[in-house]
């Protein structure tokens, strides 16, 4: 319904009456509406609701609502729907992060490495090599390095010392007679290799083809490891031909870890499947909901003088 009543708190905008050339000061329309008729000397401005597929975020004096962004492309998920007050916002599903309007999987930290910083919907996981006294025995994008089992606290001894990839193995030593001593091979200290710690910020993946300079005929090229900006590197043990390609040269300090990332580093999803996509369902696996206020580029750079 058109709305004519002006709130005391609402702002104003200037409008030139085309008929008289007079500059009029009109009340702005509330967010979610637009000015369907400007005020005159004798009448208030008239506000109408934004049609489906359009929005205005703020009170305004504009004659047409902004078009909502396109439906989220699969597999992105709709974080905020297109509504009278809000533009559509897309985000990546759990386990992925947004990079140049596509989704890339969170890096899986390999065995011997743990998560230093959790991945988010906009940032990749960062991995670090397990420090002295810690280990990681499974590849994971969520698990930190775990501390070795404390054998002594269980009245046991270390039969086999832990490494970056394995826990201590505890056991009981056979009782020795006074004339015997423990075999020289019985180790009870971590290996010296645990004295150093390497941190690897995980790869910042830019999906294939995100570079505007990429030629249509370019085949996949394995990325370079930017060794000057990382202390350690994760070994690349993938047999997939596709790596993390086309790291965007405009982003400074990208740290690329070259491990087991294949073509799926060209992916994307939906939180509330967008109106355009069908069949998206959240599985019963509990997953934290998305954070509000996900930063995204405002596609509507109109900044009309009569808006805000």
């Amino acid at each position: 319904q058109p709305e004519q009543k002006a709130s005391n708190l609402i702002g104003t905008y200037r409008h030139v009456d085309r008929a008289t050339g007079q500059v009029l000061t009109c009340d702005k329309c509330p967010a979610g509406t637009y000015v369907s008729e400007h005020c005159t000397n004798t009448s208030l401005r008239v506000c109408s609701s934004c049609p489906v597929g359009t929005f205005t975020r703020h009170e305004n004096g504009i004659e047409k609502c902004h078009d909502c962004s396109q439906p989220c492309p699969w597999p992105m998920i709709e974080k905020l729907p297109c509504a009278a007050l809000t533009d559509r916002e897309c985000t990546c599903p759990p386990g992925m992060f947004q990079s140049n309007a596509t989704c890339a999987p969170h890096t899986v930290c390999p065995v011997g490495w743990g998560v230093r910083k959790k991945g988010t919907e906009t940032e990749d996981v960062r991995c670090k090599q397990c420090a002295r006294g810690t280990f990681s025995d499974v590849p994971s994008s969520v698990m930190k390095c775990k501390a070795y089992t404390d054998c002594l606290s269980q009245n046991l001894v270390v039969i086999k010392p832990g490494t970056k990839e394995t826990d201590n193995v505890c056991g009981t030593l056979p009782s020795f007679s006074s004339s015997t001593s423990p075999s020289p091979g019985t180790a009870i200290f971590p290996r010296p290799e645990h004295m150093e710690t390497h941190e690897v910020p995980s790869s910042t993946y830019v999906p294939k083809g995100m570079n505007s300079t990429e030629s249509n005929s370019s085949a996949s090229v394995r990325p370079k490891v930017l060794s000057s900006i990382q202390e350690g590197t994760v070994p690349d043990n993938t047999s997939s031909a596709r790596g993390k390609e086309d790291v965007n040269k405009t982003l400074p300090n990208l740290q690329v870890v070259n491990h087991q990332q294949g073509p799926h580093h060209r992916h994307i999803l939906k939180l509330l499947p967008s109106m355009e996509a069908t069949g998206g369902e959240k599985s019963s696996t509990p997953i934290k909901g998305p954070k509000r206020g996900h930063p995204r580029q405002n596609l509507h750079k109109h900044f009309d003088i009569n808006e805000h």
Epitope: P75, P93, P263, H264, H267, E281, K282, S283, T285, L299
Partner: antibody, heavy 116, light 113 residues
């Protein structure tokens, strides 16, 4: 070598159930969106279902929604498709495929025949 | 749903000649935020699974010969084989991955004339 190997197909009566498996090797399975695509004899390709890397989101074709369930076990590098209330029109070769910006790795397929 | 329509259904081309396959989507698969077309092309030979040739409408998959190229934007796309070889005899499919349900074209059978 990057490989996908489907299993679990066979002959089943209408209304019956089957569970397909797809064993992945040679890549970090837990980082990839995975899909099931089918192909009826002499026909084209039809997308069936997809699941995101974490398993938290699933997508289905309307023709199988409510009857088929896609799932994955990242610790076993395995993708599954539980097919219930099977119909004659579900007869096809079922492929498991990796990826979403183009499916770049496909298995050899497993044949499902629904017939009385 | 986005419908994908391929033409022609079949195509006979002499060895060394150019083969052109068209694919039309019922809605645009171009996403303006990244200026990418969410379209892929596959090749399927008898008794084999499909093989990815092109993604993002024009980016060739690793290991695919450069005689294969993809072009087009929005709703109209083309797969071109610049110089047909005997091993290119197959059925070719386009596929959109802009929205679910993911949909394939009906396929184009390419044969040697």
């Amino acid at each position: 070598e990057v490989q996908l190997l489907e299993s679990g197909g066979g002959l089943v009566q209408p209304g019956g159930s089957l569970r397909l498996s797809c064993a992945a090797s040679g890549f970090t399975f837990s980082m990839y969106i995975m899909n099931w695509v089918r192909q009826a004899p002499g026909k084209g390709l039809e997308w069936v279902s997809s699941i995101v890397s974490s398993g938290g989101w699933t997508f289905y074709a309307d023709s199988v929604k409510g009857r088929f369930t896609i799932s994955r076990d990242n610790s076993k590098n395995t993708l599954y498709l539980q097919m219930n209330s099977l119909r004659a029109e579900d007869t096809a070769v079922y492929y498991c495929a990796r990826g979403h910006y183009g499916m770049d790795v496909w298995g050899q397929g497993t044949t499902v025949t629904v017939s009385s | 749903d986005i419908q994908m329509t391929q033409s022609p259904d079949s195509l006979a081309v002499s060895l060394g000649e150019r083969a052109t396959i068209n694919c039309k989507s019922s809605r645009s698969v171009l996403y303006s935020s990244n200026n990418k077309n969410y379209l892929a092309w596959y090749q399927q030979k008898p008794g084999q699974p499909p093989k990815l040739l092109i993604y993002w409408a024009s980016t060739r998959e690793s290991g695919v010969p450069d005689r294969f190229s993809g072009s087009g934007s929005g709703t109209d796309f083309t797969l071109t084989i610049s110089s047909l070889q005997a091993e290119d005899v197959a059925v070719y499919y386009c596929q959109q991955y802009y929205s679910t349900p993911l949909t394939f074209g009906g396929g184009t059978k390419v044969e040697i004339k």
